[in-house]
């Protein structure tokens, strides 16, 4: 988790001096509490949107945007810690919107936005906005929390982001596999215009379970440049198991973006259909 | 937590025989296809060997006749025997389990002339 690269983050708006600093999301007000503290956030809304670097590079961000309630404690808004942990890892960063004037009630309700949080393909996030003062230990909470999934990178947006490209996803390897006589799959794909090598990775499962019954791994050297761009064709042995009928074949590249850890792709292959049973045929009809 | 560990590297004159192993923890090793990749300073992760599920073997060319890769289901290791080794075998070895995509830390393997 990080912040974008943004010159100068800033928080103010018209009637409103505010600066955005870093936070620990230790807020004093939790060690101090205070006797009048605000009232939580409202409508908070959480939404992708894409952001360049100084240098130039997309990366996808968490937009982050809320109201406040027109009641008589934004005279007691200090300001707002917003914090986003990231599930999978427990990872949190925070942000501290401190205010350096009174907010005073106007024509229109006060909304907030903040987009420089980067978040990362096909992750899920928790994101807290926490009104300041936090308020005393036995008192109404006044923060709003939303969880926030990332779509990942075969999304139209998100594959021409830095961190999608840089894990391969403007390569469209367009498998296809074929089921062949004795226990054979040829496997094709478009190779990309790199000289890495690539693995194959069969796994087989019998019909309708996830617990497979057969892994190959076949490793393919890396292509001389005329080969870019044409197809490679791989012939794989299946085990010979009764049932072991359902096969996945995944591709990894090794890309010098990504090294070990590129964006996969893969294509299923099906169990035969069974031919329906035939209704047995009674031995007499009857007359009715 | 998974964790895959690599042993067995060190330096050894060319000609001669090291064994690597990888032992799993937090998973097994039984039904999955093992590999064995290497990395030489500079260089991309070379592919070296492979087992399947079943126990059949895969081998780069560079290191037919001279590798041999072995699994142990029961032990949850992984070894590659590397026998007459050549100075071009330098290298740090990993172990990788491709379908969870796990690697090891990896090993140093140095071959002296």
């Known amino acids: 988790l990080r912040l974008l690269d943004h010159r100068a983050l800033v928080c103010s708006q018209p009637g409103l001096n505010c600066t955005v600093k870093n936070s620990t999301c230790l807020d004093d007000s939790w060690i101090h509490p205070r006797n009048l503290t605000p009232s939580s956030p409202k409508d908070l809304q959480i939404q992708l949107h894409f952001a360049h670097t100084q240098q130039g590079d997309l990366f996808p961000v968490a937009h982050i945007e809320w109201t406040l309630q027109t009641d008589a404690s934004i005279l007691y808004l200090e300001g707002a810690e917003l914090s986003v942990l990231q599930l999978n890892t427990n990872e949190r960063l925070c942000v501290r919107f401190e205010f350096l004037s009174k907010l005073r009630h106007h024509h229109r309700r006060w909304r907030f936005t903040f987009s420089h949080f980067v978040v990362d393909p096909d992750q899920e996030y928790e994101v807290t906005v926490h009104h300041l003062p936090k308020p005393i230990p036995d008192g109404d909470p006044n923060h709003q929390s939303k969880n926030f999934l990332v779509p990942d990178c075969e999304h139209a947006r998100m594959k021409v982001t830095t961190p999608c490209m840089s894990s391969g996803s403007l390569w469209d390897p367009n498998i296809t596999v074929e089921t062949l006589e004795a226990h054979q799959l040829r496997v094709s794909f478009t190779l990309w215009n790199e000289s890495t090598h690539y693995q194959i990775l069969l796994t087989s499962f019998p019909h309708m379970e996830n617990h497979s019954c057969f892994e190959h791994m076949h490793h393919i050297p890396a292509p001389r440049p005329e080969e870019f761009h044409q197809r490679s064709n791989v012939t794989l042995t299946l085990r010979n198991l009764k049932g072991c009928c359902r096969h996945q074949v995944q591709i990894q590249p090794f890309f010098s973006s990504c090294l070990n850890d590129c964006l996969r792709h893969s294509a299923t292959v099906s169990c035969p259909e069974m031919p329906d049973t035939p209704e047995p045929i009674p031995d007499y009809m009857p007359l009715w | 937590e998974v964790q895959l560990v690599e042993s067995g590297g060190g330096l050894v004159q060319a000609g001669g025989s090291l064994r690597l192993s990888c032992l799993a923890s937090?998973?097994?090793?039984?039904?999955?296809?093992v590999a064995w990749y290497r990395q030489a300073p500079g260089n991309q992760r070379d592919f070296v060997a492979s087992?399947?599920?079943?126990?059949?073997?895969n081998y780069a060319d560079s290191v037919k006749g001279r590798f041999t890769i072995s699994r142990d289901n029961a032990k949850t290791s992984v070894y590659l025997q590397m026998n007459n080794l050549k100075p071009e075998d330098t290298a740090v070895y990993y172990c990788?389990?491709?379908?969870?995509?796990?690697w090891g830390q990896g090993t140093q393997v140095t071959v002296s002339s």
């Open positions: 087992t399947n599920s079943a126990g059949s073997t």
């Open positions: 990788n389990v491709p379908f969870y995509n796990y």
């Open positions: 937090g998973t097994t090793f039984s039904g999955r296809a």
